[in-house]
Amino acid sequence: MAQGTLIRVTPEQPTHAVCVLGTLTQLDICSSAPEDCTSFSINASPGVVVDIAHGPPAKKKSTGSSTWPLDPGVEVTLTMKVASGSTGDQKVQISYYGPKTPPVKALLYLTGVEISLCADITRTGKVKPTRAVKDQRTWTWGPCGQGAILLVNCDRDNLESSAMDCEDDEVLDSEDLQDMSLMTLSTKTPKDFFTNHTLVLHVARSEMDKVRVFQATRGKLSSKCSVVLGPKWPSHYLMVPGGKHNMDFYVEALAFPDTDFPGLITLTISLLDTSNLELPEAVVFQDSVVFRVAPWIMTPNTQPPQEVYACSIFENEDFLKSVTTLAMKAKCKLTICPEEENMDDQWMQDEMEIGYIQAPHKTLPVVFDSPRNRGLKEFPIKRVMGPDFGYVTRGPQTGGISGLDSFGNLEVSPPVTVRGKEYPLGRILFGDSCYPSNDSRQMHQALQDFLSAQQVQAPVKLYSDWLSVGHVDEFLSFVPAPDRKGFRLLLASPRSCYKLFQEQQNEGHGEALLFEGIKKKKQQKIKNILSNKTLREHNSFVERCIDWNRELLKRELGLAESDIIDIPQLFKLKEFSKAEAFFPNMVNMLVLGKHLGIPKPFGPVINGRCCLEEKVCSLLEPLGLQCTFINDFFTYHIRHGEVHCGTNVRRKPFSFKWWNMVP
């Protein structure tokens, strides 16, 4: 039960006080008691419940005709059952007794009022009155947790605007309102109550730039909403009529959780006594609601795809046809960014990561725009953000970034359990250097901080700086599976490729050619690849780098060897000993449910079939997956990327609600 104020009574004159329903009000009967009195008794109107405890040990008893010793160990508390119809209509009488004096009476006139700030603290999608049920001032995780949730209103419901909805002080329409969380102030007071009292709604100065609150005129159009709290306004006096009244507020978050903001916002209503114009307002009562800002959540390859994105560039029509066919098979929408908008930047995966935010009443896809800012710079903000599609970005928008700040270097695992700890939304994966040096690359700290601050997908740092491009999607992917953990981790594997090529040579296919059928590309015989000592050394190094990540992933995702599939792949070390795929990197695939778009490796053709394709199909088809090999050689591969790098996917949000987990 909420804490009320302390009321001091005195025999000299009647005391007038306000008691808010649902609060426990302390009654000080000792400090002004007549000197010679040693005991007291209390009588109260039927609407007042008086509790007297004498301790220690505390003996609690409701009032009757008993007398109680007048000593500091006696605690008297009041609660009120109903709101008053008129001011001071509930009475409490204290009678003081002494051995030689007649009883002395002190009178207390109480006004019972109902003041309650309600939000969806039970996370049902509905605001229910919660007075005296739960403490709204705490926010707790887990299925039995409580606490309201706010969405960053980061979409753009107004197509004529270039800004996010949370960047203005207006409510556009009912669509805009749905992105906000409802908070209701319920009051029940005597008619004349607010002639001597005021209610003020407020937020801590440290949080005022993270939230905006609109007051709605009940029953009217959303255009009647006016901003009452926000970056410029930490407090707002409310004009409340006496009697029974409900006031609706719509709350939007303006910022995602981050290093300097844990994501919690407390809104407080304060009841002030303004009866004495000569004196400052006195606080009579406060009620608070704590909101947590919904985190940005990534979706793994195991989530059903809903929309595929790719770029149209010079001569990639065949690539786009393949992606279109794949999207149709997977029943996905397809969005193509035209040449004039991508400015010859085809790396859709690197520009953005599509996740979502969720409150009990609303789920919203949100695009996280990377700071790489090349030709696709405007695409997320101009073409992806829109009605019910939010936007967020982090990191420096001009310079100061590395290749590791592109979002091919940002992936998320499917849900896992690691040594008994559940990650029901999976874990974020991004690449880093294995140790800092003058020229090592790392994901920008602002990006790392943002990802960690979301709390629900605890990030794992992998080692990717050994790669020329440096992205985790160059050596790993996840595919759905019908058994075990519901997925398999795919890892690029030079060892597996050498084994396959050695088997083919042993069977007399040493003359078979890699890159056969590719114009202007020097073909390589299996026997030459196997005998090239430098290439062996390069791949031995690469294998060590991938094995380091393999062990890291097994440990941090709780995986067994049987959860991992090795995809045959060779690399070569280029300038500054950075690795690049020797032939199209098959692990860099597009995963659309059971349909996989895999870079066509142009491996040695044996008995009419590419042995690399055949091997990969034999590994993945038993999982119910369908492999489509896409020719990306000249349009993507030789430009240091593949199918995954050149595409992006919006996926269905998890059915698991993030607030039900315990980070």
Epitope: V469, K521, H538, R639
Partner: antibody, heavy 128, light 111 residues
Framework: QVQLVESGGGLVKPGGSLRLSCAAS????????VSWIRQAPGKGLEWVSF????????YYADSVRGRFTISRDNAKNSVYLQMNSLRAEDTAVYYC?????????????????????WGRGTLVTVSS | QSALTQPRSVSGSPGQSVTISCTGT?????????VSWYQQHPGKAPKLIIY???ERPSGVPDRFSGSKSGNTASLTISGLQAEDEADYYC???????????FGGGTKLTVL
């Protein structure tokens, strides 16, 4: 073959900044590694910085690290050298140079470590 | 002071051969095959004449040859001609924190 032209040099006070540009013609610069090399008046060559074709990693000489930033815009067929906190000892002719990536070798022969195409240079003078 | 050591000057008569040495360490010349040589005439940009220790770009006469032994690389110019008079610089990839090093340059005079 690609031709390179440097620009952006000039006189600047110590502590000042300059941005050098290297524009390519005759070929697509995105196929090339690019380095900046400088030569102080009457002195030898000094390697300054490198950027790979994919624009994913960069390297710097100890003498300029933290002050200079190399970048590229493949759409504009250009590479840039942003020079901040300039010192008198940065006075030099700055050359832009490139090497084509030989995609046909089984193992790359390290073309990023040498420069087979050079621009004519742009003079940077740091003096108060 | 340059990281790779070259003689300040060498000279030779037309038709003769000259060799310019370039001495590094086991962390650069001795470790990698990424040694290259450049020719620079006064007031001009340098020109690549040898890469990967001994390979010649197309258009470079076969009078220019390169080799390496231990931590020392060498450029040999046979059948000297007047137009060979120039400054010559060696370069190598390095394990050090500056990954490409140059020699201090050698002035070749054709007598």
């Amino acid at each position: 073959q690609v031709q390179l032209v440097e620009s952006g040099g000039g006189l600047v006070k110590p502590g000042g900044s300059l941005r050098l540009s290297c524009a390519a013609s005759g070929s697509t610069l995105s196929d090339y590694f690019v380095s900046w090399i400088r030569q102080a008046p009457g002195k030898g060559l000094e390697w300054v910085s490198f950027i790979n074709q994919a624009n994913t990693f960069t390297y710097y000489a100890d003498s300029v690290r933290g002050r200079f930033t190399i970048s590229r815009d493949n759409a504009k067929n250009s590479v840039y050298l942003q020079m901040n906190s300039l010192r008198a000892e940065d006075t030099a002719v700055y050359y832009c140079s490139s090497a084509n990536d030989d995609v046909d070798d089984i193992v790359a022969p390290g073309r990023g470590y040498y420069m087979d195409v050079w621009g004519r240079g742009t003079l940077v003078t740091v003096s108060s | 002071q340059s990281a790779l050591t070259q003689p300040r000057s060498v000279s030779g008569s037309p038709g003769q051969s000259v060799t310019i040495s370039c001495t590094g360490t086991s962390g650069d010349v001795g470790r990698y095959s990424h040694v290259s040589w450049y020719q620079q005439h006064p007031g001009k940009a340098p020109k690549l004449i040898i890469y990967n220790v001994y390979e010649r770009p197309s258009g470079v006469p076969d009078r220019f040859s390169g080799s390496k032994s231990g931590n020392t690389a060498s450029l040999t110019i046979s059948g000297l001609q007047a137009e060979d008079e120039a400054d010559y610089y060696c370069s190598s990839h390095s394990r050090s924190s500056t990954p490409v090093l140059f020699g201090g340059g050698t002035k070749l005079t054709v007598l």
